[in-house]
Interface confidence: medium
C-alpha cells in the first residue's frame, strides 16, 4: 500500500534570484485533488494554501511582495490528498541579490610591511553577504574563502616577499550572486636581509595560509530539476 504521494515540483517565478525589494512567487505543483499545500522555509512551516476546488487545481502560488535577506534561504513544499501526505519537494534556494554592491578591502597593519610580519586582510560588505573571497590578481588558482555577516578576516600569517601583489575581494550571496570587486589593495613586502630576491609573480602559498584550490571543470556541479533553474555551485570545496 502506498504510504506517500509523489513529491511536488517547486520553482520561483520569475526567477529564484530576486533583487532586493522586488517581488517573487514560489510555485508548488502537486496533484489534482490536493486539499492542502504547505510551504516550508528553512525546515519550518511558512505558509499554507487550500485550493478551491481541489479537483480542478494542481498548482498553488505563494507570493512574496518585498524580497529581503530574511526571506532568502531554502524552501520546500508538500501537499496532501485526504489524509495522505506527499514526499517533500526538492529544495529551492531563494536568493536575494543586491548586485551593485562593492565591498571594501583593507589590510592590517598596512599595505607596506616587513617580511615576517603578520598580515590580515579584511573584506567588508554592509549587505546580506554570507561568503567572501580574497583573490590575488594574476594567473593563480589560490583563493582564500571567508565567512561573516558583514566582514570576513583573511589572515595571511607571517608574510614573505612571495605575498607581494595586488589583492581584491568579492562578496557572494548564497554562492549564486557576486558583488563587484573591491578596490585593489597592493601589498608591498620588504624582504629581509637573508632573502631579498624577487619572488615569482604567482607563488604557491604556504599550505597553512592559503587553500590551494584548483578550479577545474568538475568544480561546477549542476543539478537540473524540472520547472526550475537552479545551479548548485560547489564552490571551492
Amino acid at each position: 500500500q502506498q504510504q506517500t504521494l509523489p513529491k511536488p515540483f517547486i520553482w520561483a517565478e520569475p526567477h529564484f534570484m530576486v533583487p532586493k525589494e522586488k517581488q517573487v512567487t514560489i510555485c508548488c505543483q502537486g496533484n489534482y485533488g490536493a486539499v492542502e499545500y504547505q510551504l516550508h522555509f528553512e525546515g519550518s512551516l511558512f505558509a499554507v494554501d487550500r485550493p478551491k476546488p481541489p479537483e480542478r487545481i494542481n498548482k498553488v502560488q505563494f507570493y512574496i511582495p518585498d524580497m529581503n535577506s530574511r526571506m532568502a534561504g531554502q524552501y520546500s513544499c508538500i501537499y496532501r490528498v485526504g489524509e495522505l501526505w506527499s514526499e517533500p519537494s526538492n529544495l529551492l534556494d531563494l536568493v536575494v541579490t543586491e548586485m551593485y554592491d562593492t565591498p571594501t578591502l583593507s589590510v592590517h597593519p598596512g599595505p607596506e610591511v616587513i617580511s615576517g610580519e603578520k598580515v590580515t586582510f579584511y573584506c567588508r560588505l554592509d549587505t546580506a553577504t554570507s561568503m567572501f573571497l580574497l583573490l590575488k590578481e594574476g594567473r593563480s588558482s589560490h583563493v582564500q574563502r571567508g565567512y561573516g555577516k558583514v566582514q570576513a578576516e583573511f589572515p595571511l600569517g607571517p608574510v614573505t616577499t612571495a605575498h607581494r601583489g595586488t589583492y581584491r575581494c568579492f562578496g557572494s550571496y548564497n554562492n549564486h550572486a557576486w558583488s563587484f570587486p573591491s578596490e585593489p589593495v597592493k601589498l608591498l613586502v620588504t624582504g629581509d636581509i637573508e632573502n631579498t630576491s624577487l619572488a615569482p609573480e604567482d607563488p604557491t602559498f604556504p599550505a597553512d595560509t592559503w587553500g590551494t584550490y584548483l578550479l577545474t571543470t568538475e568544480t561546477g556541479l549542476q543539478k537540473d530539476h524540472a520547472l526550475w533553474d537552479h545551479t548548485a555551485q560547489n564552490l571551492l570545496r
Epitope: P14, H15, M17, P19, T97, M99, Y100, L133, L135, V143, F170, S172, A177, W178, S179, F180, P181, L215, T219, G220, Q222, D229, T231, Q233, L235, L236
Partner: nanobody, 115 residues
Framework: QVQLVESGGGLVQPGGSLRLSCAAS????????MFWVRQAPGEGFEWISV????????DYAASVKGRFTISRDNAKNTLYLQMNSLKTEDTAVYYC????????RGQGTLVTVSS
Amino acid sequence: QVQLVESGGGLVQPGGSLRLSCAASGFAFSNYNMFWVRQAPGEGFEWISVINRGGDTADYAASVKGRFTISRDNAKNTLYLQMNSLKTEDTAVYYCARDPLGTTRGQGTLVTVSS
C-alpha cells in the same frame, strides 16, 4: 539549464584586436553581473572583467585595464569582450561566467597571440 557559449577567439598577432561574444540562455541574464575569466595553459583561472546588470558599470583586472572593454546586450542575452593591443601573455582560453572564479561558465574560446 544554464548555457554560456563563447565565440570569437582565434590567432592574432601582438598588437592586434579580437572581439569575443558569449550567448547566454537558461537563466535571467539581465539579473546577473557577468564576468570574463581566462585560463592560460597549465594555469589557474584569472578574473579579468565584470559588468553590472544594466551594463553601465564595469571593472577590470590591472593586467587588462585600458586594453579590454566589456559590454552586454540584455535584449540579445549576449556578453562581449573587445580586446585591443593584445600581448603574447593574453594567450588563454577565455570564458564568460556568472562568478569571478569561472565556476558557472561556458566551454571557452581559445585566443592565441603570436607572431
